[in-house]
């Protein structure tokens, strides 16, 4: 339904607190360099304006679109060109082009320092003094570093953050209480960020149809007792919601997400038997709970997939009558039977099925032609299963850090032109798949591994797109989203690469490494490892092990030395010489 004032409508639906949070996220995602104080001032102005529109929808400017109102606010910022360069050119455009222009200038890798968590006492003090400002800073810092973060979900994480601080700041050992809990929230939020970026990439590159197919597969796995029409309705709504958030329509996105949660809770009988616990929660928690819901039990009496999609003599007629519906029902029927498959795999199977029908329905004897299609799925299913098996075995043998290093060597060999920080980040994230997925029951491993890897590789693609340096990476990234992971897995050592010359300064370390937290120490070592591989792409596993072991011993020895600086200065050149020799 149309509303006289869009902004008044959203303010009333969302309530002041969520409204303000979403406006702050929107501004932080568009103008990623602005300080919190500047954004919060704009948020207050927008909120005050929304309140005047709630009081009188006919008041001046209340009929303007939210994009127009937000864009006008952003374009009124003084020194916009000084701080943002060509993003200021967007302001010369009219809506909707202006918003499109803002979206194109979102930076996936902004030049911002890593978000440093203050120490526990200081954190609790500032939280207790002004919880609203403290959580506002959290929204701002996360949103500007992750300009595609799913806004309603970020509000949920802020709520979690609030809960943790409320609970832990009354404890005597605040740090012991805060650290593990905040680490858990951070880990979940970082995974959410890469997953959402993948959804926005899918929407931007391949359109709504591709995203909707993803949603149909996912919903069918979760709700195998729901009818096809019900699944398609949910997928249509989820597609709309994600399109809005990816497009910067955060108020509409959050409002529609709450509406969908309400609909699902009112229609549990036709969706899933597992929803009740979620439906008793308040709105943010309810939506999040529904998004993470466990799979419903598969109906016991499901007939073989072959009956309707291979053996039925009407297959080509049904396909011709309504291709989208027929392929949709195939994806639905296959997915609801296979919660143990990744969505990427299910979409590859649906694509294979579609290609088979396209070919066979044009031939003389279609049933004979498409009769073997299910058997032809076998190699497509085996490939990711083997990937999971070999990688989980390697993870179990090496542990997370060792597994990350193995992945780093592998990916540096595949794409040595990619910058070392990007390779290290990708390998560390890819390596976490072991901890995240390999400990799960067998039936949950494949979907966990492959869909997580796909999201991490999408991040690699997004960063590489900004400064393309590897033809192989470009090739894998420009293909279909569901083929990306197999494409990267199939890459081998890049034979065209001219090895980097050995630079002693790359492998020169100082005593400051001793005081770094473990994570930073690991990153330093992994940076050195990637540089070694770039110097010697065909180095054997044993050679790399020797050099890295030598390096670890050197750091350990010098960090224990009485005169650390002297140790690094004298032992460092010896290490460099031994490393060169070992790799010769």
């Amino acid at each position: 339904e149309a509303h006289k004032s869009e902004i008044a409508h959203r303010f009333k639906d969302l309530g002041e607190q969520h409204f303000k949070g979403l406006v702050l996220i929107a501004f932080s995602q568009y103008l990623q360099k602005c300080p919190y104080e500047e954004h919060i001032k704009l948020v207050q102005e927008v909120t005050d304006f929304a309140k005047t529109c709630v009081a009188d929808e006919n008041a001046e400017n209340c009929d303007k679109s939210i994009h127009t109102l937000f864009g006008d606010k952003l374009c009124a910022i003084p020194k916009l060109r000084d701080n943002y360069g060509e993003l200021a050119d967007c302001c010369a455009k009219q809506e909707p082009e202006r918003n499109e222009c803002f979206l194109q200038h979102k930076d996936d890798n902004p030049n911002l320092p890593p978000f440093q968590r203050p120490e526990a006492e200081a954190m609790c003090t500032s939280f207790q003094e002004n919880p609203t400002s403290f959580l506002g800073h959290y929204l701002h810092e996360v949103a500007r570093r992750h300009p595609y973060f799913y806004a309603p979900e970020l509000l949920y994480y802020a709520e979690k953050y609030n809960e943790v601080l409320t609970q832990c700041c009354t404890e005597s050992d605040k740090a012991a209480c805060l650290t593990p809990k905040l680490d858990a929230v951070k880990e979940k939020a970082l995974v959410a960020a890469v997953r959402q970026r993948m959804k926005c990439s899918s929407m931007q590159r391949f359109g709504e149809r591709a995203f909707k197919a993803w949603a149909v597969a996912r919903m069918s796995q979760r709700f195998p007792n729901a009818e096809f029409a019900e699944i398609t309705k949910l997928a249509t709504d989820v597609t709309k919601i994600n399109k809005e958030c990816c497009h910067g329509d955060l108020l509409e996105c959050a409002d529609d997400r709450a509406e969908l949660a309400k609909y699902m809770c009112e229609n549990q009988a036709t969706i899933s038997s597992k929803l009740q616990a979620c439906c008793d929660k308040p709105v943010l928690q309810k939506s999040q709970c529904l998004a993470e819901i466990e799979h419903d039990n598969i109906p016991a009496d499901l007939p073989s997939i072959a009956a309707d999609f291979v053996e039925d003599k009407e297959v080509c007629k049904n396909y011709a009558e309504a291709k989208d519906v027929f392929l949709g029902t195939f994806l639905y029927e296959y997915s609801r039977r296979h919660p143990d498959y990744s969505v990427s795999l299910l979409l590859r199977l649906a694509k294979k099925y579609e290609a088979t029908l396209e070919k066979c329905c044009a031939e003389g004897d279609p049933p004979a032609c498409y009769g073997t299609v299910l058997a032809e799925f076998q190699p497509l299913v085996e490939e990711p299963k083997n990937l999971v098996k070999t990688n989980c075995e390697l993870y179990e043998k090496l542990g997370e850090y060792g597994f990350q290093n193995a992945v780093l060597v592998r990916y540096t060999q595949k794409a040595p032109q990619v910058s070392t920080p990007t390779l290290v980040e990708a390998a560390r994230n890819l390596g976490r798949v072991g901890t995240k997925c390999c400990t799960l029951p067998e039936a949950q491993r494949l979907p966990c591994v492959e869909d997580y890897l796909s999201a991490i590789l999408n991040r690699l693609c997004v960063l590489h797109e900004k400064t393309p340096v590897s033809e192989k990476v470009t090739k894998c990234c420009s293909g279909s989203l569901v083929e990306r992971r197999p494409c990267f897995s199939a890459l081998t050592v890049d034979e065209t690469y001219v090895p980097k010359e050995f630079k002693a300064e790359t492998f020169t370390f100082h005593s400051d490494i001793c005081t770094l937290p473990d994570k930073e120490k690991q990153i330093k070592k992994q940076t050195a490892l990637a540089e070694l591989v770039k110097h010697k792409p065909k180095a054997t596993e044993d050679q790399l092990k020797t050099v890295m072991g030598d390096f670890a011993q050197f750091v350990d020895k010098c960090c224990k030395a009485a005169d650390k600086d002297n140790c690094f200065a004298t032992e460092g050149p010896n290490l460099v010489a031994r490393s060169k020799e070992a790799l010769a």
């Epitope: 029409a229 309707d308 029902t329």
Partner: nanobody
Framework: EVQLLESGGGLVQPGGSLRLSCAAS????????MGWVRQAPGKGLEWVSL????????YYADSVKGRFTISRDNSKNTLYLQMNSLRAEDTAVYYC??????????WGQGTLVTVSS
């Protein structure tokens, strides 16, 4: 017993508009997905559109996207198809149909739409 009664068909010039209606009875209308299917003279059936009980559109044929709009009024047990920018190739008998689980299980008698100058 399930009954579906279409109305609103007729002769219209290319570029013109028509609104088809379908009055449903004999079942709980607001529990079912409904749709429109058409059959052009001498041709097979073509699905036009499907709408979920909640009013969310879940399918349009590529040939009608952007021109046709399906809607429903659950309080009146009625399904609609607003057809704009009609073309000669839209000439067909239009059937209202009830969807059950994986296919249409009941159809109306159909209403003829002729697009001609």
């Amino acid at each position: 017993e399930v009954q579906l009664l279409e109305s609103g068909g007729g002769l219209v010039q290319p570029g013109g508009s028509l609104r088809l209606s379908c009055a449903a009875s004999g079942f709980t209308f607001n529990h079912y997905t409904m749709g429109w299917v058409r059959q052009a003279p001498g041709k097979g059936l073509e699905w036009v559109s499907l709408i979920h009980p909640s009013g969310t559109v879940i399918y349009y044929a590529d040939s009608v996207k952007g021109r046709f709009t399906i809607s429903r009024d659950n309080s009146k047990n009625t399904l609609y198809l607003q057809m704009n920018s009609l073309r000669a190739e839209d000439t067909a008998v239009y059937y209202c149909a009830k969807w059950s689980s994986r296919a249409f299980d009941y159809w109306g008698q159909g209403t003829l739409v002729t697009v001609s100058s």
